[in-house]
């Protein structure tokens, strides 16, 4: 069967910045900001886009040693990320996979609402253990708040744009992306 669990949570961080840090660079950030929750993230195959397989390892003392995630969709425009837990952790005799959708929606005050959907695909007529859902939700919350704390403490990190002065550009002041900035500084 398929058991769907939906939740929402808020963040004071702007949607674009949160998507960039929490979703696009989570592999690097999680072990750094939440080592008690995740010890390492290893790319098994792919470049981060759909089809990418990642192995997430957990520190000793946690119930599971690792999980493997498959990236299904990364929507940079709508800040949407779909992935599935396909191996390790709770996946086994009774649970086939967990399909997850995360959508980060901008709020009028410059923060975000995260809309999260978790679909548990069980084998046969097996039900989902309530404690598994709770543990998964708590893990997600731990990672989100750790990233949020990091972003609050490092106001320059993962910003969409930086303001470059006239002297730097030899012209008028304008906003350019970090990619352009990187390019500009190497010429």
């Amino acid at each position: 069967g398929v058991f769907n669990y939906e939740t929402e949570t808020t963040s004071v961080i702007p949607a674009a910045r949160l998507f960039k840090a929490f979703i696009l660079d989570g592999d690097n950030l999680f072990p750094k900001v939440a080592p008690q929750a995740i010890s390492s993230v290893e790319n098994i195959e792919g470049n981060g886009g759909p089809g990418t397989i990642k192995k997430i390892s957990f520190p000793e003392g946690l119930p599971f040693k690792y999980v493997k995630d498959r990236v299904d969709e990364v929507d940079h425009t709508n800040f949407k990320y779909n992935y599935a837990v396909i191996e390790g952790g709770p996946i086994g005799d009774t649970l086939e996979k967990i399909s997850n959708e995360i959508k980060i929606v901008a709020t009028p005050d410059g923060g975000s609402i995260l809309k999260i959907s978790n679909k548990y695909h069980t084998k046969g007529d097996h039900e989902v253990k309530a404690e598994q859902v709770k543990a998964s939700k708590e893990m997600g919350e731990t990672l989100l708040r750790a990233v949020e704390s990091y972003l609050l403490a490092h106001s320059d990190a993962y910003n969409e744009q930086k303001l470059i002065s006239e002297e730097d550009l030899g012209g008028e002041q304008k906003l350019i992306s970090e990619e352009d900035l990187h390019h500009h500084h190497h010429h």
């Epitope: 929402e8 808020t10 004071v12 709020t107 009028p108 005050d109 410059g110 923060g111 609402i113 609050l152």
Partner: antibody, heavy 118, light 107 residues
Amino acid sequence: QVQLVQSGAEVRKPGASVKVSCKASGYTFTGYYLHWVRQAPGQGLEWMGLINPNTGGTNFAQKFQGRVTMTRDSSISAAYMELSRLRSDDTAVYYCARQHWNRYFDNWGQGTLVTVSS
Amino acid sequence: DIQMTQSPSTLSASVGDRVTITCRASQSVGNWLAWYQQKPGKAPKLLIQEASSIESGVPSRFSGSGSGTEFTLIVSSLQPDDFATYYCQQYNSYSWTFGHGTKVEIK
């Protein structure tokens, strides 16, 4: 522990403005939304609006648009609510409340009584 | 705006009574509903969030149920400390509204 301490009671004449402060302690100020809720004498609770202490962005109930201003000073972990063009029916206790990540209000200030009278 | 209708507005009860307060939303709010208790001259205090999750430190005689548009707060055995006004609050999506309150007074 989390604490929200508000400024003292105020008396204003109709047409004037009032600014109420809410000083936060015991948590990371920029990490949680702060809301303002008011309660007229013998009446229920009325949501006024919120401020995002990280961005300074705000969102107000339609009823207060154009008359309320919410600001913050992160250096002293304080939020402010200013209400202008006061009328007698603005007489109320004004509360600041911290929003939990899941959007309910988990901590409240002690309230500030604002009396509008000629 | 989502309207919240609480009933009854006043409730007379005795210590030991089972008390039920109802809250109706004008449209579905999922389970995004909280209950607060307020005593005279004091700020509201959170009792229950997400319709049925009790806040830590809140006595187990308080319980919440419901989803969508119909919600209930139950006090299984009323204690002297429970005489107060109770408010429901919806926080669906990006709006917040309170019910008008239910005053629980001594019979």
